[in-house]
């Protein structure tokens, strides 16, 4: 009986990009007093865990702690709430949360085509490249929830590159990029060295956030 209750929320602490062998806590929570939460993962196989809800201050929640992140645990997670024990009457699913393992392959290089210091209003393009044959690059900005992603293209110098047009410069920011292979969308490279883009002038607001959050990174797979 899916959808008897409104969907819970699913969060990742400290975040959904998790370094290999590091800890991540997935937290299901809701203002509905759920007795249990079902944490479902789409990966190489579909797995579901039943978690006991804890009630505090009008909120029910349950934590699933991954003490060491591995490729086998990466994937798209969803949380369902359940009030009755048997049979399960589950809520609508939470919004999907892609848990990505990072730090698996060599880091790409990140550079600003016009240099890291730009004039306000100037068009900014960041280039991510590597000698590794990555199919996809992911560009993250500190403080933004979602990454932009672009397919990598081969260059004559033997590298694979993607150019991210950010539009007219307003605020600066710290950027990082990651490479991945299309058939392992939840497994990313080490982070590039951070690139601090600074804007000279008098900006009023930051670059627009990506219009299409990359919550679905492709067909779920698992690798090692």
């Amino acid at each position: 009986h899916e959808g008897v209750h409104r969907k819970p929320s699913l969060l990742a602490h400290p975040g959904r990009l998790v370094k290999s062998e590091e800890t991540v806590i997935l937290q299901c929570w809701s203002d509905v007093m759920f007795e249990h939460f079902l944490l479902h993962r789409e990966g190489m196989f579909n797995d579901t865990l039943r978690l006991i809800g804890e009630h505090h201050d009008g909120v029910s929640k349950a934590n699933f702690s991954i003490s060491r992140m591995t490729q086998d645990l990466a994937g798209t997670y969803r949380c369902y709430g359940s009030v009755t024990h048997s049979p399960y009457q589950v809520s609508a699913p939470s919004d999907p949360l892609d848990i990505v393992i990072i730090g698996l392959y060599e880091k790409p290089s990140l550079s600003a085509q016009l240099g890291p210091t730009v004039l306000a209003g100037e068009n900014v393009t960041l280039s991510c490249s590597s000698r590794s044959s990555y199919d996809m690059y992911h560009l993250s900005r500190e403080g933004e929830a979602h990454e932009r992603r672009l397919p990598a293209g081969p260059k004559v110098n033997g590298t694979f590159q993607a150019d991210f047009p950010l539009g007219p410069a307003t605020h600066g920011g710290t950027y990082r990029c990651f490479g991945s292979f299309h058939d392992s969308p939840y497994e990313w490279s080490k982070s590039s060295d951070p690139l601090l883009v600074s804007v000279t002038g008098n900006p009023s607001n930051s670059w627009p956030s990506p219009t299409e959050p990359s919550s679905k990174t492709g067909n779920p797979r698992h690798l090692h």
């Epitope: 993962r41 196989f45 991954i66 060491r68 591995t70 292979f181 797979r221």
Partner: antibody, heavy 115, light 110 residues
Framework: EVQLVQSGAEVKKPGSSVKVSCKAS????????ISWVRQAPGQGLEWMGG????????NYAQKFQGRVTITADESTSTAYMELSSLRSEDTAVYYC????????WGQGTLVTVSS | QSVLTQPPSASGTPGQRVTISCSGS????????VNWYQQLPQTAPKLLIH???QRHSGVSDRFSASKSGTSASLAISGLQSEDEADYYC???????????FGGGTKLTVL
């Protein structure tokens, strides 16, 4: 250093069952899948199934569905593979390996099925 | 009959470069990454290459691999006598929902 140490060789009668163990050390047992792969004498490798201990749900190759049971004991960092209704064609070396795309492998356990 | 097709044998002389092919379909190599394993006589398989072309830690740079479409290949340059072994390709298969292996290629160093 990741190590997977398997139980010793077994000789079994047709129709019986065998249970092979695989103890992991040097890594995080719960977070990695454990796969079981077998190799008949002079033949290639054949994936039987696997389990991610932290989830506890095993997944099996279609060929072995209903005849194999894969389990994991997080408290002892040990995975088990039980194969039932043994026949002579099940004579093989059985390997446990880390991951659904395995990187580290156990030393193998020879299971001989003979009347 | 293996789902991934490899030549049963390959050979070369010391110092030579040899290539081993692995052919599959859209449900395996075409949509998933390829691993390559080396199995020396009477030992467990050892991972050489993962994610199509990434060498596993400690593997010599004489080993390289690539993937194109539904085929993959492993290249061994500067062939040495200790490379004599069986080599297997492997990939996940979405239709079979499982890991599949090639039939293996026996490499002989002449």
């Amino acid at each position: 250093e990741v190590q997977l140490v398997q139980s010793g060789a077994e000789v079994k009668k047709p129709g019986s069952s065998v249970k092979v163990s695989c103890k992991a050390s040097g890594g995080t047992f719960s977070s990695y899948a454990i796969s079981w792969v077998r190799q008949a004498p002079g033949q290639g490798l054949e994936w039987m199934g696997g389990i991610i201990p932290i989830f506890g749900t095993a997944n099996y190759a279609q060929k072995f569905q209903g005849r194999v049971t894969i389990t994991a004991d997080e408290s002892t960092s040990t995975a088990y593979m039980e194969l039932s209704s043994l026949r002579s064609e099940d004579t093989a070396v059985y390997y446990c390996a880390r991951g659904f795309n395995p990187d580290y492998w156990g030393q193998g356990t020879l299971v001989t099925v003979s009347s | 009959q293996s789902v991934l097709t490899q030549p049963p044998s390959a050979s070369g002389t010391p110092g030579q470069r040899v290539t081993i092919s692995c052919s599959g379909s859209s449900s395996n190599i075409g949509s998933n990454t390829v691993n390559w394993y080396q199995q020396l006589p009477q030992t467990a398989p050892k991972l050489l290459i993962h994610h199509n072309n990434q060498r596993h830690s400690g593997v010599s740079d004489r080993f390289s691999a690539s993937k194109s479409g539904t085929s993959a290949s492993l290249a061994i340059s500067g062939l040495q006598s200790e490379d004599e072994a069986d080599y297997y390709c492997a990939a996940w298969d979405d239709t079979l929902t499982g890991l599949i292996f090639g039939g293996g290629t026996k490499l002989t160093v002449l």
